[in-house]
């Protein structure tokens, strides 16, 4: 008959190298950051420097022109979305350095990590708006002559921002701080508790609305635009194609790892080996997505130099030429004179 024997227990088999090991004191946890976390820190640092300076410059250049130039309104809003997201980076950087410890409280946990998702939705919706604008300029020039104005552009941007805020709410609501007992650590993350279905729903909506649907619609939209451009033998059509592909592709390339890991994690058990591996890559995927927040100014500069050969021009002057050139409504010219801004519509929304 089995019976309890608590008098001389053998603790030897109680072995857990990670945490809560009765034979491993509290201080014996690793102080080395994982390689994915180190890479994430490097990316965050670069994105912060380029993103804050670059987007601040874009905001400065476009803000003065936004009253009269519709393209400036688009670029101003994209830059504001990117700039806002970059402001969260020092906090996210600090958290990773501290092995994902979150000493900043519950409110910061809800708001700051949600900024990148707000950026994703704001950018993709703004990009869709810009793409619609491009489409109308090419296919409905008369309508544009009559109705395309700064007021309507601002309304479209406000709608995009409103929808982006609405779509970010689920992430915001489910973000919580969890204080772990051992080793002592406060974590900031999403917690759906019992509701795995809701977690999957949020991940699917994010994938569809923030990635797949925009990918499909923008591809179709630009296919039509480029086909019309080619058919009319518009000048610089090859360059236009290259810039469009670069701008749109960058959004989807940089968001792809985040979206793929996100959807996979929502369908996996939290204790499964695959889930744990993906969790270790989470910071890297977020940092990769954050590249979107600094890539727009780079694209604008490269596009400006490539199209106008203004290598020796000052940066603000170069950006002004790229970002504030107004589209001419006549179809043939709309792709000659505003090629750069068409392409530089950075699918940063991606």
């Amino acid at each position: 008959m089995d019976s309890f024997n608590y008098t001389t227990p053998d603790y030897g088999h109680y072995d857990d190298k990670d945490t809560l090991d009765l034979n491993t004191p509290v201080d014996k946890t690793s102080n080395t950051l994982r390689v994915p976390d180190i890479l994430a820190l490097v990316i965050f640092a670069v994105v912060f420097l380029v993103g804050v300076l670059g987007n601040a410059l874009v905001v400065w250049v476009t803000a003065f022109e936004a009253k009269r130039t519709i393209n400036a309104i688009w670029f101003l809003n994209l830059a504001v979305a990117d700039f806002l997201s970059c402001l969260a980076l020092p906090i996210l950087f600090t958290s990773i350095v501290q092995h994902h410890h979150w000493p900043f409280g519950g409110a910061a946990c809800s708001i700051l990590p949600s900024l990148i998702l707000l950026n994703m939705y704001a950018s993709i919706l703004l990009l869709a708006t810009i793409s619609a604008d491009r489409f109308l300029l090419v296919f409905k020039p008369i309508w544009c002559q009559n109705f395309r104005g700064a007021g309507l552009a601002w309304i479209a941007c406000a709608v995009a921002w409103g929808l982006a805020l609405l779509l970010t709410i689920p992430s915001f609501l489910y973000r919580v701080v969890r204080e772990e007992y051992f080793p002592p650590k406060v974590l900031c993350g999403v917690d759906y508790s019992h509701d795995k279905r809701r977690e999957r729903a949020v991940a699917i909506v994010r994938l569809v609305l923030g990635f797949l649907w925009p990918l499909l619609t923008l591809t179709i939209c630009y296919t039509f635009i480029l086909l019309r451009t080619w058919s009319r033998r518009a000048t610089r059509s090859t360059k236009t194609l290259k810039v469009v592909v670069a701008v749109v592709a960058s959004f989807f390339i940089f968001w792809l790892p985040y979206q793929v890991t996100g959807i996979m994690m929502s369908f996996l058990e939290p204790s499964s080996p695959t889930f744990l591996l993906l969790k270790k890559l989470d910071s890297l995927c977020v940092s990769f997505a954050y590249i979107n927040c600094c890539i727009n100014p780079i694209i604008y500069v490269v596009a400006g130099q490539g199209f106008q050969g203004r290598l020796r021009k000052s940066l603000p002057s170069l950006l002004r030429n790229v970002l504030t050139e107004e589209s001419v409504v006549r179809e043939s010219k709309s792709f000659t004179r505003s090629t750069v801004d068409t392409m530089a519509q950075k699918t940063q929304a991606v």
């Epitope: 945490t19 809560l20 509290v26 201080d27 007992y181």
Partner: antibody, heavy 116, light 111 residues
Framework: QVQLQQSGPELVKPGDSVKMSCKAS????????MDWVKQSHGKSLEWIGY????????RYNQRFKGRASLTVDKSSNTAYMELHSLTSEDSAVYYC?????????WGQGTLVTVSA | DVVMTQTPLSLPVSLGDQASISCRSS???????????LHWYLQKPGQSPKLLIY???NRFSGVPDRFSGSGSGTHFTLKLSRVEAEDLGIYFC?????????FGAGTKLEL
């Protein structure tokens, strides 16, 4: 062999304070949390908090914050818990337990009775 | 705080019977390390609680193999394959993943 020896029962008046001790032996005292748990008569267990002697780290359950004070004397490997402004609700058995993991080692408990 | 809901609160058994106790947590108990810190204790009258199962399914030293633990995330179960007289007492589930540590209300196993 790890042992946790707690101080004897206490009878105190409402509004008073009580300080109980838990002497540890058989392991390196500073290396592990010392946790405290309350068990009211016929009821479940309630975690009060822990003290980590290595860095004087303390964490309280919000329900006990301000009413419980955890301290240690590293020279004697003894942990202490003081309870303030006692009411009849505080009548219970209080256990110390070696933490940083599931509680394998528990003290025998200190019975505190609050009565006028 | 993580609420641990234990059922049933009382479990009358006969010696040799099977017994099963359920424990649900209001939040996931998966630690950032990937481990789940859900434990089971048995307390007999006048004694301190004693550890039976740690990390969901690991039997502690000296605990008979008629005890087994299972579950994941938020749903956990303790099973006794054949109840013996010395198994009687109050069983508590407990989580040590998150602060504050919390315990179930207890299940009294009685004849």
């Amino acid at each position: 062999q790890v042992q946790l020896q707690q101080s004897g029962p206490e009878l105190v008046k409402p509004g008073d304070s009580v300080k109980m001790s838990c002497k540890a032996s058989g392991y390196t005292f500073s290396d592990y949390y010392m946790d405290w748990v309350k068990q009211s008569h016929g009821k479940s267990l309630e975690w009060i908090g822990y003290f980590y002697p290595n860095n004087d780290g303390i964490r309280y359950n919000q329900r006990f914050k301000g009413r419980a004070s955890l301290t240690v004397d590293k020279s004697s490997n003894t942990a202490y818990m003081e309870l303030h402004s006692l009411t009849s609700e505080d009548s219970a058995v209080y256990y110390c337990a070696r933490g940083s993991g599931p509680f394998v080692y528990w003290g025998q408990g200190t019975l505190v009775t609050v009565s006028a | 705080d993580v609420v641990m809901t234990q059922t049933p609160l009382s479990l009358p058994v006969s010696l040799g019977d099977q017994a099963s106790i359920s424990c649900r947590s209001s939040q996931s108990l998966v630690h950032s390390s990937g481990n789940t810190y859900l434990h089971w204790y048995l307390q007999k009258p006048g004694q301190s609680p004693k550890l039976l199962i740690y990390k969901v399914s690991n039997r502690f030293s000296g605990v008979p193999d008629r005890f087994s633990g299972s579950g994941s995330g938020t749903h956990f179960t303790l099973k006794l394959s054949r109840v013996e007289a010395e198994d009687l007492g109050i069983y508590f589930c407990s989580q040590s993943t998150l602060i504050p540590l919390t315990f179930g209300a207890g299940t009294k196993l009685e004849l």
